[in-house]
């Protein structure tokens, strides 16, 4: 059995960012499981004093696109589109620095999901990064267009 599937997003937790677009899942049953865990994580985030407004504005859509990545339509095999590395780094090192430290020491917040590792993402100018998912972090836009 091949691994990796493209299927329409059927959830609620990330619907405002993803709609019903086609997302990549490693296995057929994974979407429901991750949906439950993202819902639980968002509930915990909503009641947490650990999350600043400047972080949550971009961390929540970023987490949705990480958990339910769009399928790469240019690929002949099912393949996820990645987050953009420059935005990932600004999120981790600037906007959400404190929150990332907290999340790293409390991995059960995300349950089945690993925290995004920016080092896993292709360098911004590489061909592999051309199709990355851009959240729209203002500082990253500036960084992206002027470097």
């Amino acid at each position: 059995e091949e691994d990796g599937f493209c299927q329409p997003y059927r959830g609620i937790a990330c619907a405002r960012f993803i709609g019903n677009r086609t997302v990549y899942m490693e296995s057929l049953h994974m979407q429901g499981e991750i949906e439950n865990q993202i819902t639980a994580a968002f509930t915990m985030i909503g009641t947490s004093s650990h999350l600043s407004d400047k972080c949550s504005q971009f961390a929540i859509p970023s987490l949705c696109h990480y958990a339910f990545p769009y399928c790469d339509e240019t690929s002949s095999v099912p393949k996820p589109r990645d987050l953009c590395r420059d935005e990932c780094e600004i999120l981790e090192n600037v906007l959400c620095q404190t929150e990332y430290i907290f999340a790293r020491s409390n991995p059960m917040i995300l349950m089945r999901l690993k925290l995004p590792n920016c080092e896993d993402l292709p360098q911004p100018e590489s061909p592999e990064a051309a199709n990355c998912i851009r959240i729209g972090i203002p500082m990253a836009d500036h960084h992206h267009h002027h470097h």
Epitope: E1, E2, D3, G4, Y24, E26, M30, I34, Y66, A67, V77, P78, K79, P80, D82, R85, R104, S105, N106, P107, M108, M111, R112, L113, K114, N117, E119, D120, L121, P122, Q123, E128
Partner: antibody, heavy 120, light 110 residues
């Protein structure tokens, strides 16, 4: 079907070099980490290192750092372990295994292993 | 040098329950170490059983369960079957490197 197949093992003299390959099929390696794990005859498992083929980021065990290099060719869906300055204690069966970049799960698929013997 | 410790060997009767543990020389094992458990039978490649303390890999029987117990990671087998006789390894994550334990030889007798 998901499969990992190692090749390139054999007999090599101390100080010599060898390159192992790990050919993946049934999945795209860019969505995963590819680990190398070795097992000396009659001994336990030892983690060697891993690569994130998507970015080329690599991490190594202290015992092999500076001598071993992990790389990947995403167009061939294959990872490699380049072993230089080989020592007798590097004699082992070398396995490659995959690990999800996104999800918490154990290394879920392993190759059958390839034997590397370092001896004069 | 970080050391991950396991019981060298354990014996259990068929149908019984046994718990294997995995400790770290750096202190208490937490979920942040993402404890992994693997099974290896003679002449075979290892097989992933559990990741992230408690998440079963597809195909892992429900009689296997993972937890944290007294500052260690634990693998519990309930209703042990003869085919569970094998070497069991744990592995812990230390920010960008994995360290395997020495393994526990589980013998099923009876």
């Amino acid at each position: 079907e998901v499969q990992l197949v190692e090749s390139g093992g054999g007999l090599v003299q101390p100080g010599g070099s060898l390159r192992l390959s790990c050919a993946a099929s049934g999945f795209n390696i860019t969505g995963y980490y590819i680990h190398w794990v070795r097992q000396a005859p009659g001994k336990g498992l030892e983690w060697v290192g891993y690569i994130s083929p998507n970015s080329g980021s690599t991490y190594y065990a202290d015992s092999v750092k500076g001598r071993f290099t992990i790389s990947a060719d995403t167009s061939k869906n294959t990872a490699y372990l380049q072993m230089n300055s080989l020592r007798a204690e590097d004699t082992a069966v070398y396995y490659c295994a995959r690990d999800s970049r996104r999800y918490v799960r154990p290394f879920d698929y392993w190759g059958q292993g390839t034997l590397v013997t370092v001896s004069s | 040098q970080t050391v991950v410790t396991q019981e060298p060997s354990l014996t259990v009767s068929p149908g019984g329950t046994v718990t294997l543990t995995c400790g770290s020389s750096t202190g208490a094992v937490t979920s942040g170490y993402y404890p992994n458990w693997f099974q290896q039978k003679p002449g075979q490649a290892p097989r992933g059983l559990i990741g992230g303390t408690k998440f079963l890999a597809p195909g892992t029987p429900a009689r296997f369960s993972g937890s944290l117990l007294g500052g260690k990671a634990a693998l519990t087998l309930s209703g042990v079957q003869p085919e569970d006789e094998a070497e069991y390894y744990c592995a812990l994550w230390y920010s960008n490197r994995w360290v395997f334990g020495g393994g526990t030889q589980l013998t099923v007798t009876g």
